[in-house]
Interface confidence: low
């Protein structure tokens, strides 16, 4: 025996109560699919939340956020706040990028700025909260005997030339090894800082401007989840 | 925060109506769906309707579709049901609910909730 | 409409130990299921939506499951606190339909 109610088009319900007869969805309402027996309640667009498609007899209504928000999750069901460029935001609402990361967006999280030391480059245009740093050419190819404008040197002797080349890639390698030094050093005294607080007593701790800044910026403790801070759910 | 204030009981003869109130507080009332429950002593939960404040639109569970009729007054943020020719069947726990705010479909879940009003039908 | 079966309607239990409550619906739900906590002489409180969420400030020992038409709530080492009544509800379709309860009593 064929069920009566798979006769009921989209944006009716087979109504149990009618004898089975099929009912144009009340209201507020939709069926998006034939032989139902109930019609769903239409999605209200509420809030922070605005209609993006009204709901029909046959389809749900669809939202999408006020301007300042943007949506997340499947089909919308979130509201985020936006954050302006060079912000991320975090539980506390939107906060600046730290020193060294950036956003060039007004959603998601502050990213590091690109190493150019890694590709073997150098920092062409520093990085700002809103922008990556631009490499350009490595140090090798900025150096005066790279360049492709020189004027013809004088010619010397075979052995002359090879002692300046290797006195010029002896200094640039102590240098590079200088630097990275340096690096390492400010990086495990700032770890040993940071384990061992205890170590270094207060007169250590100079109120820069840099430490100032810290305090405003979106620096994420590991228990600290991103986002949360501004979403809006329907 | 959101707030659902009920009156602690109300005793009504069998047979008169009686019209149970359920004031809103700390939202916008107008934007989130009213449900009401009936809870009889001992017993489960069963969902009576809910009505939309800004349009007054209304669903019901056939079961009180004849006898419970759902209004609201948006000027006062209130919401009332009102029970016509209640019998012993119906003294029970009203109370009012609120949908949550949770991403769509979860909306539909009853995040909020009013004290409950205690009806008895007694002569 | 869709019927929910819940069970036990009573269980017995000691603080520390771990039950578990399940609802059968009717028909396919697909995950459209509440959980409420009642305690003695007050309101039903949103503990599970979505048949797995836990709701806001629910602490982590109560979980959700299930799909189809079979779920369940468990809850972890039991405390004082959860004793009560627990409610499933579906909100797939009109009429919302709850569970009859299971009443938790400490043993």
């Known amino acids: 025996l064929q069920d009566p109610c798979s006769n009921c088009p989209a944006g009716t319900f087979c109504d149990n109560n009618r004898n089975q007869i099929c009912s144009p969805c009340p209201p507020n309402s939709f069926s998006s699919a034939g032989g139902q027996r109930t019609c769903d309640i239409c999605r209200q667009c509420k809030g922070v939340f605005r209609t993006r498609k009204e709901c029909s007899s046959t389809s749900n209504a669809e939202c999408d956020c006020t301007p300042g928000f943007h949506c997340l999750g499947a089909g919308c069901s979130m509201c985020e706040q936006d954050c302006k460029q060079g912000q991320e935001l975090t539980k506390k609402g939107c906060k600046d990028c730290c020193f060294g990361t950036f956003n060039d967006q007004k959603r998601g999280i502050c990213r590091p700025w690109t190493n150019c030391s890694l590709d073997g480059k150098s920092v062409l245009v520093n990085g700002t909260k809103e922008r990556d740093v631009v490499c350009g050419p490595s140090p090798a190819d900025l150096s005066p005997g790279a360049s492709s404008v020189t004027p013809p040197a004088p010619a010397r002797e075979p052995g002359h030339s090879l002692q300046v080349l290797t006195l010029f890639l002896a200094l640039t390698s102590a240098l590079l090894l200088a630097l990275i030094f340096i690096t390492l050093l400010f990086s495990v005294l700032k770890w040993i800082r940071k384990k061992f607080p205890h170590i270094f007593k207060q007169p250590f701790k100079k109120t820069t401007g840099a430490a100032q800044e810290e305090d405003a910026c979106s620096c994420r403790c590991p228990q600290e989840e991103e986002g949360g801070g501004g979403g809006y759910e329907l | 925060q959101v707030q659902l204030q009920q009156p602690g009981a109300e005793l009504v003869r069998p047979g008169a109506s009686v019209k149970l109130s359920c004031k809103a507080s700390g939202y916008t009332f107008t934007s989130y769906w009213i449900n009401w429950v009936k809870q009889r002593p001992g017993q489960g939960l069963e969902w009576i309707g809910n009505i939309f404040p800004s349009d007054s639109y209304t669903n019901y569970n056939q079961k009180f579709k004849d006898r419970a009729k759902l209004t609201v007054d948006k000027s006062s943020s209130t919401a009332y049901m009102q029970l016509s020719s209640p019998t012993s069947e119906d003294s029970a726990v009203y109370y009012c609910?609120?949908?949550?705010?949770?991403?769509?479909?979860?909306?539909?879940?009853?995040?909020?909730w009013g004290q409950g009003t205690s009806v008895t039908v007694s002569s | 409409d869709i019927q929910m079966t819940q069970s036990p309607a009573s269980l017995s239990a000691s603080v520390g130990e771990t039950v578990t409550i399940t609802c059968r619906a009717s028909?396919?739900?697909?995950?459209?299921l509440a959980w409420y906590q009642q305690k003695q002489g007050k309101s039903p409180q949103l503990l599970v939506y979505?048949?797995?969420t836990l709701a806001e400030g629910v602490p982590s020992r109560f979980s959700g499951s299930g799909s189809g038409t079979e779920y369940s709530l468990k809850i972890n080492s039991l405390q004082p606190e959860d004793f009560g009544s627990y409610h499933c509800?579906?909100?797939?379709?009109?009429?919302?339909?709850f569970g009859g309860g299971t009443k938790l009593e400490i043993k």
């Open positions: 979505n048949a797995k």
């Open positions: 028909g396919n739900i697909d995950n459209y």
């Open positions: 609910t609120r949908f949550g705010s949770s991403g769509y479909p979860d909306y539909y879940t009853m995040e909020y």
């Open positions: 509800q579906q909100y797939w379709t009109i009429p919302y339909t």
